[in-house]
């Protein structure tokens, strides 16, 4: 697995650097997770032809993956820092069950899948420190998550490959939209 943010050789070699601000740490954390997703997608795409499937064909799945919409306050029109932050944290919390599902889906990138999961937990902590309105954040119900996980793991091989691909693609997109919004805060 890649080295977590702040521990790369560049940082070690430059002790005179200013410590990272909260925003820079969040930015770096998201970029680190995106690197992990990229590596996982590589393995997925090498294993199956899911990556060639059109968005329309893939849209007919029953996964309720978090997605950024204009009403969430993260887009430039109607941008609202607090609403957006709540959406990002809520979305990441909702993705956690899907990241758990990914844990047994990779052979050569098992460590990478774990790194993505753990780094996402750290990112959520960073963002929660930044948020003022923590009461507005709804945490997914553990029982619902457990039954969803069981259901996903019971799918046939083709559907599991499809689910893996969709989770990675949607998570990447959600993180990119989050990264863009957070840099405006």
């Amino acid at each position: 697995a890649p080295v977590p943010p702040g521990e790369d050789s560049k940082d070690v070699a430059a002790p005179h650097r200013q410590p990272l601000t909260s925003s820079e740490r969040i930015d770096k954390q998201i970029r680190y997770i995106l690197d992990g997703i990229s590596a996982l997608r590589k393995e997925t795409c090498n294993k199956s032809n899911m990556c060639e499937s059109s968005k329309e064909a893939l849209a007919e799945n029953n996964l309720n993956l978090p997605k950024m919409a204009e009403k969430d306050g993260c887009f430039q029109s109607g941008f609202n820092e607090e609403t957006c932050l709540v959406k990002i944290i809520t979305g990441l919390l909702e993705f956690e069950v899907y990241l758990e599902y990914l844990q047994n889906r990779f052979e050569s990138s098992e460590e990478q899948a774990r790194a993505v999961q753990m780094s996402t937990k750290v990112l959520i902590q960073f963002l929660q420190k930044k948020a003022k309105n923590l009461d507005a954040i709804t945490t997914p119900d553990p029982t619902t998550n457990a039954s969803l996980l069981t259901k996903l793991q019971a799918q046939n091989q083709w559907l599991q490959d499809m689910t893996t691909h969709l989770i990675l693609r949607s998570f990447k997109e959600f993180l990119q939209s989050s990264l863009r919004a957070l840099r405006q805060m």
Epitope: L34, C74, F75, Q76, S77, Q176, S177, R183, Q184
Partner: antibody
């Protein structure tokens, strides 16, 4: 390979609305991380960023021109359209469309069109 | 808005010279800094992305360095075809902003 091409009028009258179309190929504006934007350059002057539209339809505008600009995309036609209202002679410039594509959303403009010179005069 | 200040405005060089072009951001933009070259009557082209990342097809004599708010574009041995205007760009946050450019000319 990636190409972008601007089209639209070369001459517009003051107060009129300018509509420019960017037609591109070699990439899709439905791919996450992709954005297409507009930049202009008055004769002999520096580059000025105008607007950018993302794969997910988020739109960003230059604050000084926001009230006059609208950017839209037609993913199926591989086109991005910029409209600029209430044109003035100071808007005379070469208008470029360009692409940004990056996992980290660095907003580096890696491919540019050839540009189209728009003159505003009565 | 993040203001990008480039210096010098004009640089007169002799082929073979090593030159440095400076770009300063009005606030920290981390590594979200890009360099473009624009030759006379041509569209700009991306030279360096994210401070120091090289771009396919760009000669290796071009390199970038810096971090935070101070950045440098270096040309290690200027060729006559390098004549043109060089722009730096803030890619951190909106509005995206360009510097006023540094004009590179031959003595």
């Amino acid at each position: 390979q990636v190409t972008l091409k601007e089209s639209g009028p070369t001459l517009v009258k003051p107060t009129q609305t300018l509509t420019l179309t960017c037609t591109f190929s070699g990439f899709s504006l439905s791919t996450s991380g992709v954005a297409v934007g507009w930049i202009r350059q008055p004769p002999g002057k520096a580059l000025e960023w105008l607007a950018l539209i993302f794969w997910d339809d988020d739109k960003h505008y230059s604050p000084s021109l926001k009230s006059r600009l609208t950017i839209t995309k037609d993913t199926s036609k591989n086109q991005v359209v910029l409209t600029m209202t209430n044109m003035d002679p100071v808007d005379t410039a070469t208008y470029y469309c360009a692409r940004s594509y990056d996992d980290y959303l660095y907003y580096a403009l890696d491919y540019w069109g050839q540009g189209t010179l728009v003159t505003v005069s009565s | 808005d993040i203001v990008m200040t480039q210096s010098p405005a004009t640089l007169s060089v002799t082929p073979g010279d090593r030159v440095s072009l400076s770009c300063r951001a009005s606030q920290s933009i981390s590594d979200y800094l890009h360099w473009y070259q624009q030759k006379s009557h041509e569209s700009p082209r991306l030279l360096i992305k994210s401070v120091s990342q090289s771009i396919s097809g760009i000669p290796s004599r071009f390199s970038g360095s810096g971090s935070g708010s101070d950045f440098t574009l270096s040309i290690n041995s200027v060729e006559p075809e390098d004549v043109g205007v060089y722009y730096c760009q803030n890619g951190h946050s909106f509005p995206l902003t360009f510097g006023a450019g540094t004009k590179l000319e031959l003595k």
